[in-house]
């Protein structure tokens, strides 16, 4: 029979979503036991019927990877998880709707540091995406915000930071002190879309200078 | 050498389309950021639509949504601009550009576009 | 929408003088703002971006800064070539948008 309350076997099902990838994650409830075996179901917005989704059937694990089923920017998705323990009790629950545009968040982006006499290099690597173009490529961040940029700091000493910010890849701090030590912070801005990254993080010293040696 | 040459301008009724093309060069067209602007006569610019070349996301200032669709074909280096439903206020000269290296730096030199009846 | 403020419409200079254009955001757009130069029957041409970084080839007779959602262009010292109409751009959020312009005539 089923129980009085699906949370009971099952409980806080939802996408979890980074960089779009895609991963669908419950709990169990209080009267889950691990021999409680799931099963993962997903569907568009507006379609009427529900796909199995191969390979999260009769699961024991709490998480799906949905990445691939999720994957069209312009679409919303659902999905549902049936419980059922040992005893034979099932219990479904649904998420609600998602849009990997809206919901994912954004990792922090893979910068290269350098170190120069008196200035600070920052390179930012476009970070890509599991979503594949037509043509095969995948997508960067970059392919699908319009209004990415990055924001960079640097602490200069406990008072004053320098700030740069832009589309491109390639920054540079100048004016800096030789052989002193400083931390760069970098990150994702999306404005429009309310998303701002973690911090990447450098510690790097410039060079000393050696035109006086 | 970076270059982008619009083409398909025009005298046309309201009421009627038209299409603008602009044909690219020296650099990668099928990763990048183009736009259409558009200057009308004695007036300020505005941008009126946006297109990644790899993902195909668009956008498009609210006063032409509905009634252009920006699009290109890759394999020809070429962004298009199809324009219905032309009003008389739409009459501007119109430039693609393109977004290199994080700048919005690469223009066309533009392309008359003029709806009159 | 963002709005852009630009002031003013139209200023006369003299060859040399220190000419200095603002544009005012109506939110805050970081320092993602560029400056244009646009002369007659041609495109425009960036100047400056990241709201202080002169672009490669430009004079370093023109710079800009900001403070908080304001910005300036400041041409030290005018010269003949420098006369033409100069845009600022926010490139923050879509739909970008420009500032109204400010024509650079000879006094």
């Known amino acids: 029979h089923a129980p009085e309350d699906p949370s009971d076997l099952l409980q806080h099902v939802k996408f979890q979503s980074s960089n779009f990838e895609n991963i669908l994650t419950w709990d169990s409830g209080p009267e889950g036991t691990p021999d409680t075996v799931y099963s993962i179901e997903y569907k568009t917005y507006g379609e009427r019927d529900w796909v199995a989704k191969k390979g999260c059937q009769r699961i024991t694990r709490k998480s799906c990877n949905l990445t691939v089923e999720t994957g069209n920017l312009t679409e919303l998705y659902y999905a549902r998880v049936t419980a059922v323990s040992a005893g034979g009790r099932s219990a479904t629950k649904m998420t609600d709707r998602f849009s990997s545009l809206q919901h994912t968040t954004l990792k922090p982006p893979d910068v290269t540091c350098i170190s120069k006499v008196r200035s600070i290099q920052m390179i930012v690597h476009p970070t890509p995406t599991p979503i594949r173009a037509g043509d095969g490529h995948r997508l960067t961040l970059e392919d699908i915000f319009h209004d990415l940029f990055y924001h960079l700091e640097l602490q200069v000493n406990r008072t004053y930071q320098m700030h740069l910010g832009g589309k491109q890849r390639e920054y540079e701090f100048f004016g800096l002190t030789p052989d002193t030590e400083f931390l760069g912070t970098i990150m994702i801005c999306v404005p429009t879309w309310a998303k701002e990254s973690a911090p990447y993080m450098c510690r790097v010293k410039t060079l000393p200078d050696r035109t006086w040696t | 050498e970076v270059q982008l040459v619009e083409s398909g301008g025009g005298l046309v009724q309201p009421g009627g389309s038209l299409r603008l093309s602009c044909a690219a060069s020296?650099?990668?067209?099928?990763?990048?950021?183009m736009y259409w602007v558009r200057q009308a006569p004695g007036k300020g610019l505005e941008f009126v639509s946006v297109i990644n070349t790899r993902s195909g996301i668009t956008h498009y200032v609210e006063s032409v949504k509905g009634r252009f669709t920006i699009s290109t074909d890759n394999a020809k280096n070429t962004l298009f601009l199809q324009m219905n439903s032309l009003k008389s206020e739409d009459t501007a000269v119109y430039y693609c550009?393109?977004?290199?290296?994080?700048?919005?730096?690469?223009w066309g030199q533009g392309t008359q576009v003029t709806v009159s009846s | 929408d963002i709005q852009m403020t630009q002031s003013p419409s139209s200023l006369s200079a003299s060859l040399g003088d220190r000419v200095t254009i603002t544009c005012q955001a109506s939110q805050s757009i970081s320092s993602m703002l560029a400056w244009y130069q646009q002369k007659p029957g041609q495109a425009p041409n960036l100047l400056i971006y990241g709201a202080s970084r002169l672009q490669t080839g430009v004079p370093s007779r023109f710079s800009g800064s900001r403070s908080g959602t304001s910005f300036t262009l400041t041409i030290s010292g005018v010269e003949a070539e420098d006369l033409a109409t100069y845009y600022c751009?926010?490139?923050?959020?879509?739909?970008?948008?420009f500032g109204q312009g400010t024509k650079v005539e000879l006094k």
């Open positions: 751009l926010q490139d923050y959020s879509w739909p970008l948008t």
């Open positions: 020296g650099f990668t067209f099928s990763s990048s950021w």
């Open positions: 550009a393109t977004r290199i290296q994080g700048l919005i730096d690469y």
